[in-house]
Amino acid sequence: GSGIFQLRLQEFVNQRGMLANGQSCEPGCRTFFRICLKHFQATFSEGPCTFGNVSTPVLGTNSFVVRDKNSGSGRNPLQLPFNFTWPGTFSLNIQAWHTPGDDLRPETSPGNSLISQIIIQGSLAVGKIWRTDEQNDTLTRLSYSYRVICSDNYYGESCSRLCKKRDDHFGHYECQPDGSLSCLPGWTGKYCDQPICLSGCHEQNGYCSKPDECICRPGWQGRLCNECIPHNGCRHGTCSIPWQCACDEGWGGLFCDQDLNYCTHHSPCKNGSTCSNSGPKGYTCTCLPGYTGEHCELGLSKCASNPCRNGGSCKDQENSYHCLCPPGYYGQHCEHSTLTCADSPCFNGGSCRERNQGSSYACECPPNFTGSNCEKKVDRCTSNPCANGGQCQNRGPSRTCRCRPGFTGTHCELHISDCARSPCAHGGTCHDLENGPVCTCPAGFSGRRCEVRITHDACASGPCFNGATCYTGLSPNNFVCNCPYGFVGSRCEFPVGLPPSFPWVA
């Protein structure tokens, strides 16, 4: 049932031992009680005891006190269980009877006689407090108390709310006095069936099946599932969402395994040569005179740099060289002349000028010739005049630079502007960058080419690059990009310090 009407009989007084019909009991009134509980009636009528009925064994003779008894026959208080919502009103009929027969089951005895009866009608709320009453008539007095309480697992004002504490797959809770659920520690939800994950466990990227646990969804890792897992094979890169690989400063390639600062990290160039982060292997060594090889590791012949001047011939020695000078010259490199202008020492149409009162001379060479005697033809490419990887080519008296794609100018010094083709729509401003053109858009437009018209949320079009977080500003058309490490600019479009000439870098 959902509740119990409890009636505690306390004292019955029938001093004269009289029955209701005026006769006296011989030798005394052996008294038992019949109780009938039914729905509220303004005028109590015979008929079924709709809320229940109960009888007692013989409790005493004439006048007696009824003791509390918790089990067996003669239990007191009397229990009238019900299995419905307690309506809050009732009618109660308590009858005292005399039996000449069996003490324990007087109901079944013939010849029972009514001593007295009382009828109570009224309202009664569910609660633990006993309501005490006393009823008198001319011959008898009955003292009693009564209450309505809810059965185990039933709660509320009418014992209509069922709540049974549990700690299993279907819920983890205890019951409050009003029947509402009180979740056990670590559980939440309407039925306390949702675990409370480890504090800080990412709401979207983590979950749990029991309290204080944090299980990561695919693509996430870490104690709180707030670290993305980069693309498999990503070497020197990070991610802002799973399976990305965004290269760290100084690294390139799809898997960030190409060293853009190879020169700094590995020092591959030997013998004082210069290293630049360019070329098919990511670096190029420019050798000092006297060295060759990919890493300038090979020493050339000491004569390879042509140290002997004025037509002197060079001879290699163990750690040095020796110049054999032609007639009229002397010195370590045949740099000193014993000739004068009278000896016509200037070749290729060079003009001779006397010096030191005619004891020596100097040649003024025509275009395309050099050397102290104008004996060498000028190689106009020796000074490496072509910038940005351009190839130098000798063309008769002049030289030309053959530029790599994206460069122009006499010395390939000019970057061909990607902005020349006006890629920015709606009046956007174009900026030439190492990675290509970037547009700064006017208010109301966004996108890499300012092609997206902003209607509501300025962040909706994803104006921030390189994994940056977008925040809308003071008005709908404003936004602010919060750049990840390694990027700057109003849209985080500029990589910080990107080396310009490595093959992986456009």
Partner: nanobody, 120 residues
């Protein structure tokens, strides 16, 4: 939504050729570098080639240099990988990828892949 769809894979004999295509959509194609990487069963992925947004700078892994050629057709929003002199060790799933920037520096978006099997 950025999409990269690979096609052109299949079964080929050693020494044969294949041409893979990567059709791109959902972004301004000529703003982004595009590359190819491959993954054989039980092995780490290997970046094999990449072409910058302008098409002026290309990269090849040593294992494919001289045999594979990458190119792009900005008008068709497509990148191609011409694979010649194929070897059994070229067998893998080939993926198209972009770093989401003009230079070949990382992976942001990846296609579903196309299987290439080199076997006699």
């Amino acid at each position: 939504e950025v999409q990269l769809v690979e096609s052109g894979g299949g079964l080929v004999q050693p020494g044969g050729s294949l041409r893979l295509s990567c059709a791109a959509s959902g972004f301004t194609f000529d703003d982004y570098a595009i590359g190819w990487f491959r993954q054989a069963p039980g092995k780490e992925p290997e970046g094999i080639s990449c072409i910058s947004s302008s098409g002026g700078i290309t990269y090849y892994a040593d294992s494919v240099k001289g045999r594979f050629t990458i190119s792009r057709d900005n008008a068709k929003n497509t990148v191609y990988l011409q694979m010649n002199s194929l070897k059994p060790e070229d067998t893998a799933v080939y993926y198209c990828a972009t770093p989401g920037i003009a230079a070949c520096r990382g992976i942001h978006y990846t296609g579903q892949g196309t299987q290439v099997t080199v076997s006699s």
